[in-house]
């Protein structure tokens, strides 16, 4: 498999058959698949060097792995997008052997003197062809030469099979399955041959191709493949329930932010709640996690403005649940990204010198910001798309707080909507879905560059649009939701999570 190890070295060779038998639409589809693969790999913070070859009678090398920009995913994607099927129109035979020889030439080194670290570089060849080579001879001989060059299958104790993966995608109206199978790697419990119809569900294909065991701790990563559970798609999501004898129980959500901490809303708990009465589950697992302590933001005080006629005051409505035992990360349990951390800098593919302010400008610009939250409906987690009103609609969004029960007599809305809040909901630019009571404490998320970054914690709403846990279809325009802006509580997060290796900026 493609081992995505941010600390490893990898060359990926994209080889695309542009011969007559492929056809323009299949060529375009294959290109799209490769663009998606480049993006998927880049989302892991891995920076492989790419080689890019198209071929028919002759190969054309568009990107060499030795080029400075070959590890710049955006630049490689641009080169790929600029390739036309017509480029091989005049000489449209199929010489797959020559194309693979072009790959071999990129792999090999001058004077047979291997560079330092050559034996630690993994090589991945992704060949898109119909297998109908009609000139140049059998391409399998070049695969053998490549294996020989990389010292694969020669050493009994160290066969190095994981240093070469050859994936073949059958494209075109007629595919020679025998030829394609012959070229692809054969490894136990791995799939290296894919068909055209597989490409309709690329996430499923990538799931078969990628080994992410070295990057399970990466924040904000998800798997969207069809066989995935809700928690493959939202692996940070935590369910919280507080049992109060004779008072029933309170349900909330939270987000895994590190191996020991779940971030949620402070209002989910009262000072009387004991740790043993708080149940937290992650990854869709039945068992509850043992809790060491709940840490409230020191400025949170729900009764802080009772004298001023404000029955409930949600400023600084955040809490961290510290777990007794370390979480074991996997595909259904992994952290979400937090603002102003090194992990988020890498997730957004920003330079290492990026400041907290620059992250804020990237994630929360002064405009309507597309975001999402996760809600549970009929035992299923679903993503709800909303817009954070952070531009010209911000004022009107915040003013609608006056329609919340108990806030109707508030003269100055900034008394309840402090600078700590982000506002969503309403009907412009689109009709936003609203949060339900049980969504409280869950993350408000910005999805960028295939990664998920938490920017807020769901706190309170103006209208209860979820009578009997069913979302009403028709809701008033003033149905707004308010979320604690994580950029505004960073000093507290940084202090409490200082031992969690998150690299706060």
């Amino acid at each position: 498999k493609i081992v995505l190890d941010p600390s490893g070295s990898m060359n990926i060779y994209l080889v695309l058959d542009g011969s007559d038998s492929i056809g323009a639409s299949n060529f375009t589809g294959a290109k799209k698949c490769l663009v998606n693969l480049i993006e998927k790999v880049a989302s892991y913070g891995v920076k492989p060097r790419y080689g890019l070859v198209t071929y028919a009678t002759y190969p054309k090398i568009w990107v060499k792995v030795s080029e400075a920009d070959s590890s710049n995913a955006d630049w490689v994607t641009k080169q790929l997008n600029e390739i036309n099927y017509e480029d091989h129109k005049l000489k449209s035979g199929t010489n797959t052997k020559k194309a693979l020889q072009a790959v071999y030439s990129m792999m090999s080194w001058p004077d047979d003197v291997p560079p330092e670290g050559w034996n630690r570089t993994r090589h991945v060849i992704i060949l898109m062809t119909d297998g109908l080579h009609n000139m140049g001879g059998d391409p399998i001989t070049v695969i053998d030469e490549i294996r020989d060059l990389l010292y694969i299958g020669k050493d009994r104790k160290n066969p190095r099979e994981d240093y070469l993966d050859v994936y073949v995608f059958g494209v075109g109206p007629l595919v020679n399955q025998v030829n394609i199978n012959a070229l692809a790697s054969k490894k136990d419990n791995e799939q290296h041959v894919f068909k055209v119809k597989d490409m309709e569900n690329l996430e499923d294909v990538f799931y078969q191709m990628i080994d992410e065991s070295q990057s399970l701790s990466l924040c904000g990563m998800v798997w969207e493949h069809r066989k995935g559970t809700d928690y493959h798609k939202q692996p940070w999501q935590a369910k919280i329930s507080v049992i109060r004898p004779s008072k029933g129980h309170e349900s909330c959500m939270g987000a895994v932010v590190s191996e020991y901490f779940v971030l949620t809303a402070a209002h989910c708990f009262t000072v009387d709640d004991k740790e043993h009465s708080i149940k937290v589950s992650v990854g869709g697992e039945k068992r509850d996690l043992e809790i060491e302590v709940v840490l409230f933001h020191p400025n949170y005080n729900i009764n802080g403005k009772k004298e001023a006629g404000i029955p409930e005051f949600y400023d600084y409505d955040v809490a961290l649940i510290k777990l007794k035992n370390k979480l074991k990360y996997g595909q259904t349990i992994r952290p979400i990204c937090l603002p102003c951390t090194e992990g988020t800098t890498r997730a957004l593919r920003l330079p290492p010198t990026t400041t907290c302010q620059q992250q804020k400008e990237e994630l929360l610009p002064a405009q309507d910001i597309k975001a999402l939250f996760v809600s549970e409906e009929e035992k299923k987690l679903t993503r709800k798309e909303v817009y954070i009103k952070n531009g010209d609609k911000k004022g009107s969004c915040e003013r609608d707080a006056q329609y919340a029960p108990g806030y109707d007599k508030v003269k100055d809305i900034s008394e309840v909507v402090t600078p700590r809040f982000l506002c969503t909901g309403g009907v412009s630019p689109y009709a936003d879905p609203n949060t339900c009571r049980g969504d409280s404490g869950g993350p408000l998320i910005v999805h960028k560059r295939s990664r998920f970054i938490q920017v807020g914690v769901i706190s309170w709403g103006v209208v209860d649009v979820c009578k009997n846990q069913k979302r009403q279809k028709q809701v008033p325009a003033h149905a707004r939701d308010f979320h604690i802006n994580l950029f505004q509580v960073l000093p507290w997060l940084k202090e409490k999570l200082q031992d969690e290796d998150l690299g706060f900026l």
Partner: antibody, heavy 121, light 111 residues
């Protein structure tokens, strides 16, 4: 045909140095481990060390008895293995063999004819 | 390091007889399903010759009367019916762990 030929043996005084060579033909030299083995008169075989193949960067490994005194190196362009022996002792007197160590099964499948080193005053 | 002990030190047999030579390792020489134990034959004035690799695999060109067996720490070289040219010294050698080590040898002599 695989062939290994040792050279450089001879008479040397205690404390002296000697460099043995092992020229090879008939195989891709850099793809193999190459070992040195010696045999003192009337005694058994003693493995001295090897140079690993290219996937391991040709790094050497030594037996404790010669570590620090003997150095194994190779010149892949000349398909030649070397054994540099320093601070020689009388007990280093032996026939010195080079052998190809096949990584396909980790056994010494081809041997040279040996070269005699005599350490004596 | 792994110490290899061969037994017997000397074995006196006649042509046509069956020879059984033993080699015991101070610790297992198995790795990932393979036993890294090899057997060599050496005749006077000659370089050693590989007979058996990985405990039981006969090197090409070696007669079928030579066979190897064993795993872990106990290994055996068997010569089913001795020929006159088989009388020599036999060494076991492990290649599982660095440093490689040889046994002290078993001398097979004509009775």
């Amino acid at each position: 045909e695989v062939q290994l030929v040792e050279s450089g043996g001879g008479l040397v005084q205690p404390g002296g140095s000697l460099r043995l060579s092992c020229g090879t033909t008939g195989f891709t030299f850099r793809d193999y481990y190459m070992s040195w083995v010696r045999q003192a008169p009337g005694k058994g075989l003693e493995w001295l060390g090897f140079s690993r193949h290219r996937a391991y960067g040709y790094t050497p490994e030594y037996a404790a008895s010669v570590k620090g005194r003997f150095t194994i190196s190779r010149d892949n362009s000349k398909n030649t293995l070397y054994l540099q022996m320093n601070s020689l002792k009388t007990e280093d007197t032996a026939v010195y063999y080079c052998a190809r160590d096949n990584p396909g099964y980790y056994a010494m499948d081809y041997w040279g004819q040996g070269t005699l080193v005599t350490v004596s005053s | 390091e792994i110490v290899l002990t061969q037994s017997p030190a000397t074995l006196s047999l006649s042509p046509g007889e069956r020879a059984t030579l033993g080699c015991k390792a101070s610790q297992s020489v198995d790795y990932d399903g393979d036993s890294y134990m090899n057997w060599y034959q050496q005749k006077p004035g000659q370089a050693p010759r590989l007979l058996i690799y990985a405990a039981s695999n006969r090197e090409s060109g070696i007669p079928a009367r030579f066979s190897g067996s064993g795993s872990g720490t106990d290994f055996t070289l068997t010569i089913s019916s001795l020929e006159p040219e088989d009388f020599a010294v036999y060494y076991c050698q492990q290649s599982n762990a660095d440093p490689y080590t040889f046994g002290q040898g078993t001398k097979l002599e004509i009775k």
